[in-house]
Structures are given as C-alpha cells and as structure tokens.
C-alpha cells in the first residue's frame, strides 16, 4: 500500500512540476523592470525566453517575439534549450509513469517492468527537474550581472547633460514558478525512484529445505507456514498467512482473464 | 461616438473645496487610464492626474498631490478630481482626456472651468 | 520633473509653407523595451480642447492628415507640417508621455502672414 501511495503521490508531484515548468517557459515575465529607486514611468517592460512586452499606464500592452535566433544571447539560448529538454523529459516520464502506475494494469506486465518503468519515469523526472532549475539559475544569474552592470552604468552615466532613464531588470514571476516546479518535479522523481525498490520483486531465492517425513514429500519455506508446491499457484486476492511482515503490495500478483485496464 | 463631458467647476474662495465630475459615454469606460489636465488663463497646459483602467493606481502633479484626489466610479461611468486647500493659481480650465496608446489622450472633454478668488 | 521645451514660441507663416517645429526634453522619452519614444503632439484651436495629432513621436493619430510629421528620439524631436493650410493655424504643444509627473511644452504658435 505504502509503494503505490508513494508511486501515485511521486506522480502527482511531478505531473504539477511539469505543469510548471512548462508555464513558466511559456511566462512573458521571466524579467520585470526594477521599479525601485527609477523615476516612475508610465511604462512598464517585462521579458520572456520568447518575447518582450510593454505595459503603457493606459492599460494598453504590446508584446514583441525575439524573430531571430542568431541575434540572441547565447545564454538566453541556453536557457531555452534546458527549458525545453526539461519538459520533453518531463512529458516522457509522465506517459512511462501512467503505464507504471501500480493502480493500472496493461495486459500481463508484470511488477520487474512496472519497477523498471518507475525507475525509468523517476530518473527522466529528476534530469527534467535538474534542467528546469538550471535554466532558470542561469536566467537569474544573467540578471544579477546585467542589474549591477546597468546600476554601474546608471551612477557613472551623470555627468552628461541628458539624463536617461535607465532601466534595470529584476526577478520576474516565471523565475520563481520555475524554481518551484523544478524542485517538485525533482520530489516527484525521488518519490518514483523510492517506489520502484518497493515495486521490484525480491531477486533472493531460499532454497527450500527438504524434510523427509513419513507421508508426503513436502517442502517448506523458512518464515512462513505456507506449504509450497514449486512455483507461486497462489490466485489473485487469495489472503494467504505470511510469517514475515510483508505488505501485500509485496506478494507478487497474476493477471486473470478478468483484469482489464 | 466617444464623449467627456466635465462639470462642478465654479467660483470658490481660497482655501475652499471642489468636486468636479467627468462623465463618460460611447466606450467600455473601465477598459481605459484617465487623466486630468488644466489650461491656466496664459494657455499653459498643466497635467494634473491620472488614474488606471481599475483604479488602483494614481499619480498625481508633485505641486497637487496633497490637495487633489483622482478617484472613478466603474458603475457611474464617471470619473472625479477632489481638490481642496484650492489658491488662486489652481484658477483654470480642467479638461478630463482618455489615455489611449502611448499614454496620449485621444479624446478630450469640453473643459469645465475653476475660479479661485476672495 | 522632465522639463519640455518648445521652440520657436511663434511662428508666421504663408501658406503652402513648409514649417517645423521643435521639442526638446531634459530626459530621454525613449523606453528601451520597445524602442518607442513616448513624445505626444497636440493641436489647440482657439475656444477648442486639445487634439491629439501624433504620439509614439512618430505615429499619426487615425484621421490626422498625412501632411504632419513627427520624427525624432532621445531629447530631441520634431513636427513638421509639409504644407501649411489655413486651418493649421493654432497651437501645438509637446508632452513627455512617459515618465510622471507628465509635463507639457508651452506651445508654438503657428499664426498665418
């Protein structure tokens, strides 16, 4: 029970975390205009990794695209780039975490693959987690240098007569989105890894020790009382007494011909 | 067609208070910045104030803003300028204007107009 | 404050003239997030509210007719009527758009010879 709570919240987490990440790539303000200690203009400019916009006190806005690719910053580049790997990661582990998920069958999967699918989602979760957060630690640390470089600018600008209103960028709302959803994308991954341990099958095989007892030839496994007959011929939702304190999300089970997804 | 039409100007005394309205008509009146501006009896034009479309922003002339309140009635389709602690140099024509793009006033109203004298 | 000044306080002309005015401000009206100065030109008539011509320093009001320009960036701009008809006759004032508290030029008078 504990492994699919665990699985299912992991997938939860990181299907919000994606769901952010991709908002915040798609957000226009990823830099918003430094209102603090500036002149007040009546307009306001915020930046995105796709275009810029300008918001007139009039309530009028205008968004202009970055129509080129060649003419922009590298870094901005960069930061696009691990946006975009962080959601292609993102949406891949989601539909390999769907066709994981413990509470949904397909066919006759059986619990190795569905572990294995979880490993596979929760990795691609932390990578796209990894990607989000960097990109937008770069985009952050683009604006702390470009901040101090125009307030530098801005102090030693005065001796001319002309002033200029310069305008300094700072932290946008996109930026935090991106910090947090990254970071639940990153949970949300941990949280798969962590339930596909308790998904995978125990790969320990005890050999069975034979007791020749007048009668019948039984083998008996140690920690049970369970009489074993070869393989697992246990049905689907048979209760069956286990000496250990195995969950029964642990006790391999078999599709029937009345499974369906 | 759009239309400002003001009212409330009149003869007051210094250091009386005024309320003058600006009615609007023939546009969404809540989509819109709106402002303020005087002409002095030299024909200077002064800007007194604006407002956003939602109201909650106001900027004000440093030489009025303690004496002169911006404020708009969504419902009323109106907008106001409260001045009080009036002097004889706030004696003008107050026109209210529609901030369109570029923050430019693209319609303008007839003026309504404010006498301050003893 | 920005302080707008406008030159030449009046000006006689004949017409059919070519005439230009001018604006200067003491702060740069041009905004860097989208390259646009945030100049306004107005025309006053006598007994008539103010009439927005040109804002944007260089983009005309629908209905304006295509005989007033505006250009300029930075500081310094300019309106320029190509040809002066009879009923250009009236004042023209600049204002900063951009950063508050807005302010206004004191006008160019533009009277006919």
């Known amino acids: 029970m504990a492994v699919t709570a665990c699985q299912g919240l992991g997938f939860v987490v990181s299907l919000i975390g994606i769901a952010g990440i991709i908002a915040a790539t798609c957000m226009d303000q990823w830099s918003t205009q430094d209102l603090y200690n500036n002149p007040v203009t009546a307009v306001f400019n915020y930046q995105g990794l796709w275009r810029s916009c300008v918001r007139e006190s009039s309530g009028f806005t205008e968004c202009r695209g970055y129509f080129t690719l060649l003419g922009l910053p590298a870094m901005l580049q960069a930061v696009r780039a691990l946006m975009i790997v962080g959601i292609v990661l993102g949406a891949i582990g989601l539909l390999v975490s769907i066709f994981a998920l413990k509470c949904i069958r397909i066919g006759s999967m059986e619990d190795s693959a569905k572990a294995n699918m979880t490993l596979t989602s929760g990795i691609m979760f932390i990578v796209s987690g990894l990607c989000a957060i960097a990109g937008v630690s770069v985009f952050a640390n683009m604006l702390v240098t470009n901040f101090w470089m125009s307030t530098a600018n801005m102090y030693t600008g005065m001796g001319g007569m002309v002033q200029t209103v310069q305008t300094r960028y700072t932290f946008g709302a996109a930026l935090f989105v991106g910090w947090v959803a990254g970071g639940l994308t990153l949970i949300g991954g941990v949280m798969m890894c962590i339930a596909c341990r308790g998904l995978a099958p125990e790969e320990t095989n005890y050999k069975a020790v034979s007791y020749h007892a007048s009668g019948h030839s039984v083998a008996y496994k140690p920690g049970g009382f369970k009489a074993s007959t070869g393989f697992g011929s246990n049905t689907k939702n048979k209760k069956i007494y286990d000496g250990g304190a195995r969950t029964e999300d642990e006790v391999q089970s078999y599709p029937s011909k009345h499974d369906y997804v | 067609q759009v239309q400002l039409k003001e009212s409330g100007g009149g003869l007051v005394k210094p250091g009386g208070s005024l309320k003058l309205s600006c009615a609007a008509s023939g546009f969404t009146f809540s989509s819109y910045a709106m402002s303020w501006v005087r002409q002095t009896p030299e024909k200077r034009l002064e800007w007194v104030a604006a407002?956003?479309?939602?109201?909650?922003?106001?900027y004000n002339s440093d030489t009025m803003r303690d004496r002169f309140t911006i404020s708009r009635d969504h419902a009323k389709n109106t907008l106001y300028l409260q001045m009080s602690s009036l002097r004889s140099e706030d004696t003008a024509l107050y026109y209210c204007?529609?901030?369109?793009?570029?923050?430019?006033?693209?319609?303008w109203g007839q003026g309504t107009s404010v006498t301050v004298s003893s | 404050d920005i302080q707008m000044t406008q030159s030449p306080s009046s000006l006689t002309v004949t017409a059919g003239e070519k005439v230009t005015l001018t604006c200067k401000s003491s702060q740069s009206l041009l905004n860097s997030g989208n390259q646009k100065n945030y100049l306004t030109w107005y025309q006053q008539k006598p007994g008539q509210p103010p009439k927005l011509l040109i804002y944007?320093?260089?983009t005309r009001e629908s209905g304006v007719p295509d005989r007033f320009t505006g250009s300029g960036s930075g500081t310094f701009f300019t309106l320029t009527i190509s040809s002066v008809q009879a009923e250009d006759l009236a004042v023209y004032f600049c204002q900063n758009d951009y950063v508050y508290p807005f302010t206004f030029g004191a006008g160019t008078q533009l009277e006919l010879k």
């Open positions: 204007g529609r901030q369109s793009f570029g923050n430019a006033l693209d319609y």
């Open positions: 407002i956003h479309s939602n109201g909650g922003s106001t």
């Open positions: 944007w320093a260089s």
